[in-house]
Interface confidence: low
Amino acid sequence: CPTSCKCSSARIWCTEPSPGIVAFPRLEPNSVDPENITEILIANQKRLEIINEDDVEAYVGLRNLTIVDSGLKFVAYKAFLKNSNLRHINFTRNKLTSLSRRHFRHLDLSDLILTGNPFTCSCDIMWLKTLQETKSSPDTQDLYCLNESSKNMPLANLQIPNCGLPSARLAAPNLTVEEGKSVTLSCSVGGDPLPTLYWDVGNLVSKHMNETSHTQGSLRITNISSDDSGKQISCVAENLVGEDQDSVNLTVHFAPTITFLESPTSDHHWCIPFTVRGNPKPALQWFYNGAILNESKYICTKIHVTNHTEYHGCLQLDNPTHMNNGDYTLMAKNEYGKDERQISAHFMGRPGVDYETNPNYPEVLYEDWTTPTDIGDTTNKSNEIPSTDVADQSNREH
């Protein structure tokens, strides 16, 4: 444990003013594992002036950092980059003249306590005023800054010319794009101080590159993947005071694909489960032994789960008999193309025929497709047929 500090397995505290510490406490190799430290308390350390970029990075489990009544003047921008668990920071009564939001923007902080610091009234700390104004809790801090006359001024009264939140405006074409095509988004940002512009593309799969020049930026997305349909793309403007973003949703049109089609399973009803992808939403058509299957209340398509451009459902059959055994083909079609897949279904043997002679179809419950709640019922009511007994034209046995 560093001189002037005490350590336990989860805590480091340095409160003795003499001899004091001149650098952020670091644990000796082969001592306590720094990853297990959840709290660091530093007080009365007038010679601790700087938190360098790599001082805190080893304490990845750190939740509470308290440095009070000390000499902290500078904190490196990336000091807390690896401390994603930090929830409480208390820098009360230090020598901080400035502090950037960049120190903390990646953290999910519950508390950031900064009272008693000699902040300089400048645009650098305007973000703190904005933070105070947007905080819902009533216990807002009394933060002050020193103006040009070295007079203490409440941060709430701080007025700095040319120092405000930035703006971002996305000029996007119709962001409905065909798979494989390309699109370019343009964004302009504004504000004083002049913001930086960056793109937040999340987990975009498609190849993309951006160009930024001062207040203008463009993002070119090439060979657009259907996996990116529904994803949000944001243009972000960021300056000292804060950030603004403008977002668009990408819609990718693509030909249907039947990614899953299985033999029937029995639950409340018999179900031939399927998954179809496509955008716009594909029209579904079933064929039985090569002929169009007219749906009815006894045989109908049910979509149970829609996941953006993916549809999970069933061809639902009520009490099918051996007359319904046969080849079932699903065709999915939209304006960009079509796909079809076929399975052989065996519901029961013919009366008097030993079931054991028939193929063994597993009776697996396919819960995803047989939930009672239907999402997006695509039942075709136009060609109703009276019963499940569809004529077995080929007279084939299965």
Partner: antibody, heavy 116, light 110 residues
């Protein structure tokens, strides 16, 4: 070993521009502040400003704000002090120093002479 | 900018103890630590003491520092002829958000 090496002496005319350098080695250049200090002939030390090379955050002494520009290029571990228009009163020795608890490492100094 | 105040000169005979004072205000020495630097004319300053009284490695124990309120002092024990130099104190000034140096003291070994 830790050292700061400054560029050579300069003789300039009033109104000319100048950029002097300070190259750090033997330590993590991006994680220590660099200070610039002026010493006019026969006079004491004056603090001009500091820069954090990791992100080029810069602070100036009120006396030097607007008179000089401090910058850094972390890719080559070098800090700079520049003037856009020199005056005769800028004639001095200029030192760079690393901030590590105090100004613990100093450059050898760059003598700048401004004379018509 | 207002710096720290030091006596222009100090002197002593070899073997003597000499102290150099450094006076500031509540915004610098009063609330921050003091460092000391030594400069032989024609060369760069050298780091002598930091944190009011801490010696970097290589600095003889003859050099010591102290601080009280808004003043600090440097003491040189067992004065030697090669201690002749200019000595500067420095401290961070909160109101200036920057360092301030002392006016400098020329130490002469008689």
């Amino acid at each position: 070993q830790v050292q700061l090496v400054e560029s050579g002496a300069e003789v300039k005319k009033p109104g000319e521009s100048l950029k002097i350098s300070c190259k750090g080695s033997g330590y993590s250049f991006t994680t220590y502040w660099i200070a610039w200090v002026r010493q006019m002939p026969g006079k004491g030390l004056e603090w001009m400003g500091i820069i954090y090379p990791g992100d080029s955050d810069t602070r100036y002494s009120p006396s030097f704000q607007g008179q000089v520009t401090i910058s850094a290029d972390k890719s080559i571990s070098t800090a700079y002090l520049q003037w856009s228009s020199l005056k005769a009163s800028d004639t001095a020795m200029y030192y760079c120093a690393r901030l590590g608890g105090g100004m613990d490492v100093w450059g050898q100094g760059t003598m700048v002479t401004v004379s018509s | 900018q207002a710096g720290l105040t030091q006596p222009p000169s100090a002197s002593g005979t070899p073997g003597q103890r000499v102290t150099i004072s450094c006076s500031g205000s509540s915004s610098n020495i009063g609330s921050n630590t003091v460092s000391w630097y030594r400069q032989i004319p024609g060369t760069a300053p050298k780091f002598l003491l930091y944190g009011n009284n801490q010696r970097p490695s290589g600095v003889p124990a003859r050099f010591s520092g102290s601080k009280s309120g808004t003043s600090a002092s440097l003491a040189v024990d067992g004065l030697q002829s090669d201690d002749e130099a200019d000595y500067y104190c420095a401290a961070w000034d909160d109101s200036l958000s920057g360092y301030v140096f002392g006016t400098g003291t020329k130490l002469t070994v008689l």
